[in-house]
Interface confidence: low
Amino acid sequence: RKIPKVGHTFFQKPESCPPVPGGSMKLDIGIINENQRVSMSRNIESRSTSPWNYTVTWDPNRYPSEVVQAQCRNLGCINAQGKEDISMNSVPIQQETLVVRRKHQGCSVSFQLEKVLVTVGCTCVTPVIHHVQ
Amino acid sequence: GITIPRNPGCPNSEDKNFPRTVMVNLNIHNRNTNTNPKRSSDYYNRSTSPWNLHRNEDPERYPSVIWEAKCRHLGCINADGNVDYHMNSVPIQQEILVLRREPPHCPNSFRLEKILVSVGCTCVTPIVHHVA
């Protein structure tokens, strides 16, 4: 079935909707579930066979200003002996999120939604072998 | 909120943070990047901690479709292709921001919502609890 895009819906528009200028939408950036916490297993970035590090990126004209990115530590994966096994590959797992970008044009300020690709962690995969003819 | 450097030539404004409500352009930057993880890579099948992807749909949200990962096994796949329960497959979770229609069903009025998604799985050494 049809998936509604932002600005479109297959619901009837209720009477209570706020008036919005054409070509834009009203966005409340008071976040729902702001205090929710990730309950991931402890230290998985160090315990993983494809371990990773975290880097915090900061941009004052982005909301949220802090975005955490992961980077795989190795090309290969860590085997049972704690050594890197390059017959396997550590690869990044990525997820899209939305941010609000503030743009300055002279003294006026505008806001733009932006999709950002976040590297969340790494996983160990069997490599794709390309056979040369 | 976050602080921004002020342009000294602009009228003085005490609010250096993002306002609570903003009007944003309907066009989302980078909107057309590939959002179906099943198509974007086959890591979910090739991983030693493979996962399935379940479609979560909510027309009151943008994006309306989010793919959730669920680890296939409690253990990890070893070199023989068997499940090794001495290791654990665990989900990698991430908080992401989505848009929630507010008030409900309104076409052009949204609120940011933080949701927790499982993006994939990774193989970890288990935490062993030694009983005293």
Epitope: - | N52, N56, E68, N82
Partner: antibody, heavy 119, light 107 residues
């Protein structure tokens, strides 16, 4: 069609051990995990653990780690659960359940085995 | 472990009634929730998986919804053969856990 046939009711003495069986048919036994669950009026349904018949790998709920031992015999397509050092707390109905490993959910349950521990 | 709190424990309804059962998880389980029907003298049967996906062959009067921590199971028009115990189960995290069950009785 998929069937999980469990062994009959057991009446055993405290301190003894018992081995319950779950005979699988209608599918490739070694391709699917087999899980075991305990049901009592007080605690309801409790997950005990899982065995992967293909490689014998097991995982247990911490609560049952010293109580249950899961095994599987591929030749007879039968999963077993041995319960040791039995007490009245072990009196329950025990179910084996097939887990669709790829899809990630339980689909077929055995009919259950009633275990009564009494002197 | 994740606690699944199921309500109500008992339901006494007439044929044709609409029935709603809820399950609340102690932490987010995404959509990894299943609903089962357990009729007297039979094995439990899977009705709903992934919170809202009706399992093969299950009549469309049975529906499920929810995501995260709050889940709902509905029988739109109860029939006499629906007399059973219904329970939810999460397989988001090990140890997998179950709701306490709802006994549905038909007047």
């Amino acid at each position: 069609q998929v069937q999980l046939q469990q062994s009959g009711a057991e009446l055993v003495r405290p301190g003894a051990s018992v081995k319950l069986s779950c005979k699988a048919s209608g599918y490739t036994f070694s391709d699917y995990e087999m899980h075991w669950v305990k049901q009592t009026p007080v605690h309801g349904l409790e997950w005990i653990g899982v065995i992967h018949p293909g490689n014998g790998g097991t995982a247990y709920n911490q609560k049952f780690r010293d109580k249950a031992t899961l095994t599987a015999d591929k030749s007879s397509t039968t999963a077993y659960m041995e319960l040791s050092s039995l007490t009245s707390e072990d009196s329950a109905v025990y179910y084996c359940i097939r887990f669709l490993t790829y899809e990630g959910y339980f689909d077929y349950w055995g009919q259950g085995t009633t275990l009564t521990v009494s002197s | 472990s994740i606690v699944m709190t199921q309500t109500p424990k008992f339901l006494l309804v007439s044929a044709g009634d609409r029935v709603t059962i809820t399950c609340k998880a102690s932490q987010s389980v995404n959509n990894d929730v299943a609903w089962f029907q357990h009729k007297p003298g039979q094995s439990p049967k899977l009705l709903i998986n992934y919170a809202s996906n009706r399992y093969t062959g299950v009549p469309d009067r049975f529906t499920g919804s929810g995501y995260g921590t709050d889940f709902t199971f509905t029988i739109s028009t109860v029939q006499s053969e629906d007399l059973a115990i219904y329970f939810c189960q999460q397989d988001y995290g090990s140890p997998y856990t179950f709701g306490g069950g709802t006994t549905l009785e038909i007047k």
